[in-house]
């Protein structure tokens, strides 16, 4: 089973200039080799994937993952019960909803079972790692001759999410975007009846219930208005 490791928004791609430079190379042993970083995301508070780059290991190694919650009733060390694999090597762990406690400090420990001293422990705030599902059921209604209202649904507690609406006409080269708070509706006050509009929305777990940086996927687009005779190649490229 091959897993896809999520790196949303393309802003997490720094290479780690790790610290073999700070130690004499002749003194390196297996236990001093750094372990890969663990990155966790909580998907719609339904499950959580904690993944690592298994290919960074000098030789294929089935690293093991343990976790617990600091200062809580759930502070007993737990073994990963559902590993994710990449080319038959462990590359992640999936935790189910009942194992996710958003507002307690999550502690995750990666270990090399062949070299138990080779371990790394990280602490995470899960409320900052929630990625909601994309908004669904986009609907448009006309409020007046020139005003449109866009509505949508989220499969989550609505007050926890903020939203970003993008829209464009088939004459536009770029999207216009507008931030929307937890109310999940957006009004466009002046619509040109001669143009075809495309709308899409994404959501983020911020700022009331967490401080997540990552947005959901974009919703399926929804269209309004007549097809224009001017075909814009940008529109088709962005919808692909």
């Amino acid at each position: 089973l091959n897993t896809t490791i999520l790196t949303p928004n393309g802003n997490e791609d720094a290479t780690t200039d790790f610290f073999l430079t700070s130690m004499p190379t002749d003194s390196l042993s297996v236990s001093t080799l750094p372990l890969p970083e663990v990155q966790c995301f909580v998907f719609n508070v339904e499950y959580m994937n904690c993944t690592w780059n298994s290919s960074s290991e000098p030789q294929p190694t089935n690293l093991t993952l343990h976790y617990w919650y600091k200062n809580s009733d759930n502070d007993k060390v737990q073994k990963c019960s559902h590993y994710l694999f990449s080319e038959e090597i462990t590359s992640g762990c999936q935790l189910q909803k009942k194992e996710i406690h958003l507002y307690q400090t999550f502690v995750v420990q990666l270990q090399d079972p062949r070299e138990p001293r080779r371990q790394a422990t990280q602490m995470l705030k899960l409320q900052n790692l929630v990625i909601p599902w994309a908004p669904e059921n986009l609907t448009l209604r006309k409020l007046s001759e020139s005003q449109l209202e866009l509505n949508w649904n989220n499969r989550f507690l609505n007050h926890c999410l903020e939203h970003l609406v993008q829209y464009r006409t088939d004459w536009d080269h770029s999207w216009t975007e507008q931030s929307v708070d937890y109310r999940h509706k957006f009004s466009l006050p002046s619509v040109d009846g001669q143009k075809r509009y495309t709308f899409r929305v994404r959501s983020r777990f911020n700022p009331l219930c967490g401080s997540a940086q990552h947005w959901s996927e974009w919703s399926h687009p929804i269209h309004w208005g007549s097809n224009s005779s001017k075909e814009n190649p940008f529109l088709f490229a962005l919808e692909a």
């Epitope: 720094a14 200039d17 940086q213």
Partner: nanobody, 126 residues
């Protein structure tokens, strides 16, 4: 390569405050997870406070509510404000840094840190 230099240690009475500073040179603090650790005589080195470059900070149970970590990227420095010091806080305090790829990575394991300062002695008398 990162060089770390701690300052601000000393001998104080129980209940007093101290502020430790850690100045980094050799590179900026961006994309560095930072940590404060301490080692008392005859004991293992233990984490005190750790911070990811995304801004999440975590404290050891024993110092939560008394110690405060802060970071000044412009000055390439991190600080540990220690209030209500107790004799059991007596230790050598070390600043540590680890280059990380992810904004959320905050290591509480000392062996995950690449770079270390020389340490600052903090002694709390009763």
């Amino acid at each position: 390569q990162v060089q770390l230099v701690e300052s601000g240690g000393g001998l104080v009475q129980a209940g007093s405050s101290l502020r430790l500073s850690c100045a980094a040179s050799g590179r900026t603090l961006s994309r560095l997870a930072m940590g404060w650790f301490r080692q008392a005589p005859g004991k293992e080195r233990e984490f005190v406070a750790v911070n990811s470059w995304g801004g999440d900070t975590f404290y050891a149970d024993s110092v939560e509510g008394r110690f405060t970590y802060s970071r000044d990227n412009a000055k390439s420095a991190v600080y540990l404000q220690m209030n209500s010091l107790q004799p059991e806080d007596t230790a050598v305090y070390y600043c540590a840094a680890a280059p990380t790829s992810f904004a959320t990575t905050a290591y509480s394991s000392s062996n995950s840190y690449a770079y270390w300062g020389q340490g600052a002695q903090v002694t709390v008398s009763s």
